[in-house]
């Protein structure tokens, strides 16, 4: 049994950097916790942009410092990435992971395309 | 090293070049002229671990990821532990995309 | 895996096939390369998918429960012990191995 990950195909981040998407998991089993991480690609680079761990029923917590939230409703969380900027458009990948109880599953979105438009500066007033 | 069957013998790998506790991490072995087989994962944080059937209640696997270490502790070796042990780590996308170059366990009276 | 040897010369096509006893999904199928004396080396995830560094020789493909490594052309170090894996559930299994030796 394989566990598929559905996510958005593109999306485009606020004027204020924010971006949000769904990642929606079909659950091969009654997982009681489940790990959500965000990765990055940019050509053949695979960088971590968050994770959180979360107790099936709970919200998931990303760390302090962490650029994204997220909440998580059933087999759907809800993520917002913020702080963006037009250099941080790319390819955001979705992963899941039963963590517990066995059998682990490992699940992959295909990627959500975000598209990052840096805000023109207001002109200067006289 | 040589260790004689019924005792006991502690793997350690030391990892560099990467966000240790962003990975999970493996041991897998490979008994003499064999094939690979996964032994023991250990997530993340270290709360939580798998293990194969063959080595269930014997093998323990921890990290400690303030100095990016695994640890396999193995207890109750049999002849048929004997094996090149190596840890891997579990790339962003789920294959093992890093080994260590191997330690050989032989368990041997 | 088979089969288990592959007698091939350098600059042949060496194709090698792993065969799943079950089901599975193509983005958790891995091939690794093992020299004599090595560590294994990831070649190809996601069962097409090329590992960083690993030369546009090799290339993999299938679905479901057929998957297929191909060496389009052989050279001196590509003679080595090739295993698939599947990495998409717990246990992560292996599969037994082809032997691919100069002919």
């Known amino acids: 049994k394989a566990m598929h990950v559905a996510q958005p195909a593109v999306v485009l981040a606020s004027s204020r950097g924010i971006a949000s998407f769904v990642c929606e998991y079909a659950s091969p089993g009654k997982a009681t916790e489940v790990r959500v991480t965000v990765l990055r690609q940019a050509d053949s680079q695979v960088t971590e942009v968050c994770a959180a761990t979360y107790m099936m029923g709970n919200e998931l917590t990303f760390l302090d410092d962490s650029i994204c939230t997220g909440t998580s409703s059933g087999n759907q969380v809800n993520l917002t990435i913020q702080g963006l900027r037009a250099m941080d458009t790319g390819l955001y990948i979705c992963k899941v992971e039963l963590m517990y109880p066995p059998p682990y599953y490992l699940g992959i979105g295909n990627g959500t395309q975000i598209y990052v438009i840096d805000p023109e500066p207001c002109p200067d007033s006289d | 090293g040589v260790v004689q069957p019924g005792r006991s013998l502690r793997l350690s790998c030391v990892a560099s070049g990467f966000t240790f506790s962003s990975h999970g991490m493996h041991w897998v072995r490979q008994a003499p002229g064999k094939g690979l087989e996964w032994v023991a994962v250990i997530w993340y944080d270290g709360r939580n671990k798998y293990y194969a059937d063959s080595v269930k209640g014997r093998f323990t696997i921890s990290r400690d990821n303030s100095k990016n270490t695994l640890f396999l502790q193995m207890n109750s070796l049999r002849a048929e532990d004997t094996a090149v042990y190596y840890c891997?780590?579990?790339?962003?996308?789920?294959?093992?995309?890093?080994w260590g170059q191997g330690t050989l366990v032989t368990v041997s009276s | 895996q088979s089969p288990g040897t592959l007698s091939l010369s350098p600059g042949e096509r060496a194709t090698l096939s792993c065969r799943a006893s079950q089901s599975i999904s193509s983005s958790f199928l891995a091939w690794y390369q093992q020299r004599p004396g090595q560590a294994p080396r990831l070649l190809i995830y996601?069962?097409?998918s090329r590992a960083t560094g690993i030369p546009d020789r090799f290339s993999g493909s299938g679905s479901g429960t057929d998957f297929t490594l191909t060496i389009s052309r052989l050279e001196p170090e590509d003679f080595a012990v090739y295993y698939c894996?599947?990495?998409?559930?717990?246990?992560?299994?292996f599969g037994q191995g082809t032997k691919v030796e100069i002919k």
């Open positions: 996601g069962a097409s």
């Open positions: 894996q599947q990495y998409g559930t717990s246990p992560w299994t």
């Open positions: 891997a780590r579990g790339g962003h996308f789920g294959p093992f995309d890093y």
